[in-house]
């Protein structure tokens, strides 16, 4: 019941390579680097995009007062609200990580709370009543998690580095065509 907005600002979560699809280890023959028409542009982070805000999972910081009936916290608390788009949705040649990114549609990721923290707040009540202490659970960080075909949207799957392991018993194909052939080894990561 009682949350009064006080102020807010935003922080981008720039994904780390351990959390998101990583570029393949060998990039010498990567045509993204070597194509003349691209001016030999260097390899990009797989989720890098000119408009980061369009595709990043953002942490919006809200500073609020906690209220409980007539009582209000002595000091405001700062909480995060998770917002924004989770990739991958960028120009194809730089999306060299795992996953079948050449498809027109693919795994759906959502920006949702990752970690929570508990904070004790002191509530001041009117009419000279004694202050009350209360614990509130606040969002501490946000993360991109995948909607899976086996769960509903409330049960989201972590998109972490463990997803990079190739399917059990599957032989990696030879790297016949440079870095992009690495896609074959990682194509079942989703």
């Amino acid at each position: 019941q009682g949350w009064q907005a006080f102020k807010n600002d935003a922080t981008e979560i720039i994904p780390e390579l351990g959390e998101y699809p990583e570029p393949p280890p060998e990039l010498e023959n990567n045509k993204t680097m070597n194509r003349a028409e691209n001016g030999g542009r260097p390899p990009h982070h797989p989720f890098e995009t000119k408009d980061v805000s369009e595709y990043s999972c953002r942490e919006l910081h809200f500073t609020r007062y906690v209220t409980d009936g007539q009582c209000r916290s002595a000091k405001p608390v700062t909480e995060l609200v998770c917002s924004g788009q989770c990739g991958p949705a960028r120009l194809l040649p730089n999306a060299i990580g795992r996953g079948k990114w050449w498809r027109p549609s693919g795994p759906d990721f959502r920006c949702i709370p990752d970690r929570y923290r508990a904070q004790r707040v002191q509530l001041l009540c009117p009419g000279g009543a004694a202050p009350r202490a209360r614990k509130v659970r606040l969002v501490a960080s946000c993360k991109c998690k995948r909607l899976t075909r086996f769960h509903n949207q409330s049960e989201l799957k972590d998109f972490g580095p463990e997803a990079a392991r190739p399917q059990k018993g599957r032989k990696p194909r030879p790297r016949a065509r440079g870095a992009k052939a690495n896609q074959a080894e990682l194509e079942n990561a989703y």
Partner: antibody
Framework: EVQLVESGGGLVQPGRSLRLSCAAS????????LHWVRQAPGKGLEWVSG????????DYADSVKGRFTISRDNAKNSLYLQMNSLRVEDTALYYC????????????WGQGTTVTVSS | QSVLTQPPSASGTPGQRVTISCSGS????????VNWYQQLPGTAPKLLIY???QRPSGVPDRFSGSKSGTSASLAISGLQSEDEADYYC????????????FGGGTKLTVLG
């Protein structure tokens, strides 16, 4: 101007083969994944096949698997669809389409070429 | 029979807001992003919405997409006569080896 132009359609008997081509211009060809989508007369859209930057990045619809082969020639800015063992139900307008963005929909389309399979 | 289910028709008058639904399953809409296409009479399809709710440049903000669970919807506000077209939803389907599946299409008629 970004453009995809399909060719190679025509009238063919069941069981025969046909090869469709799609010529691209106005963009960096191998920045795009490319697809074939068909539309039977008076019906909806049906995805046929798609190919990424290279030949090991290929998908087919179940209805054409084993009969159709998609390929691309980046040097010629061209996409192909080799259609074998054609059936009457393959009769449709075949569109060439591309996506420049991973999981970002088909954002470039050609005007289509008509394939009629009839005896 | 299409894997994704859309109403065959929808209608509205100029200025109205119209919503087109698209129903799927856990193997397609439930776990993958949804795209929407517009096909004007006698022309090739055009991408309208990608990744559930993103508009390509040049698409008016009258068009918006949303997704919840195994269903998606396309909303068109401030309906205009030039919006009369067929609309298709599409998503990757993870069944078997997978394929890109379209809805059967919805013919939108702008009345009056």
């Amino acid at each position: 101007e970004v453009q995809l132009v399909e060719s190679g359609g025509g009238l063919v008997q069941p069981g025969r083969s046909l090869r469709l081509s799609c010529a691209a211009s106005g963009f960096t060809f191998d920045d795009y994944a490319l697809h074939w989508v068909r539309q039977a007369p008076g019906k909806g859209l049906e995805w046929v096949s798609g190919i990424g930057w290279e030949d090991d990045m290929i998908d087919y619809a179940d209805s054409v698997k084993g009969r159709f082969t998609i390929s691309r020639d980046n040097a010629k800015n061209s996409l192909y669809l080799q259609m074998n063992s054609l059936r009457v139900e393959d009769t449709a307008l075949y569109y060439c389409a591309g996506n420049s963005r991973g999981y970002g929909g088909l954002d470039v389309w050609g005007q289509g070429t008509t394939v009629t399979v009839s005896s | 029979q299409s894997v994704l289910t859309q109403p065959p028709s929808a209608s509205g008058t100029p200025g109205q807001r119209v919503t087109i639904s698209c129903s799927g399953s856990s193997s397609n809409i439930g776990g993958n992003t949804v795209n929407w296409y517009q096909q004007l009479p006698g022309t090739a399809p055009k991408l309208l919405i990608y990744s559930n709710n993103q508009r390509p440049s040049g698409v008016p903000d009258r068009f918006s997409g949303s997704k919840s669970g195994t269903s998606a919807s396309l909303a068109i506000s401030g309906l205009q006569s030039e919006d009369e077209a067929d609309y298709y939803c599409a998503a990757w389907d993870d069944s078997l080896e997978g394929s890109y599946v379209f809805g059967g299409g919805t013919k939108l008629t702008v009345l009056g």
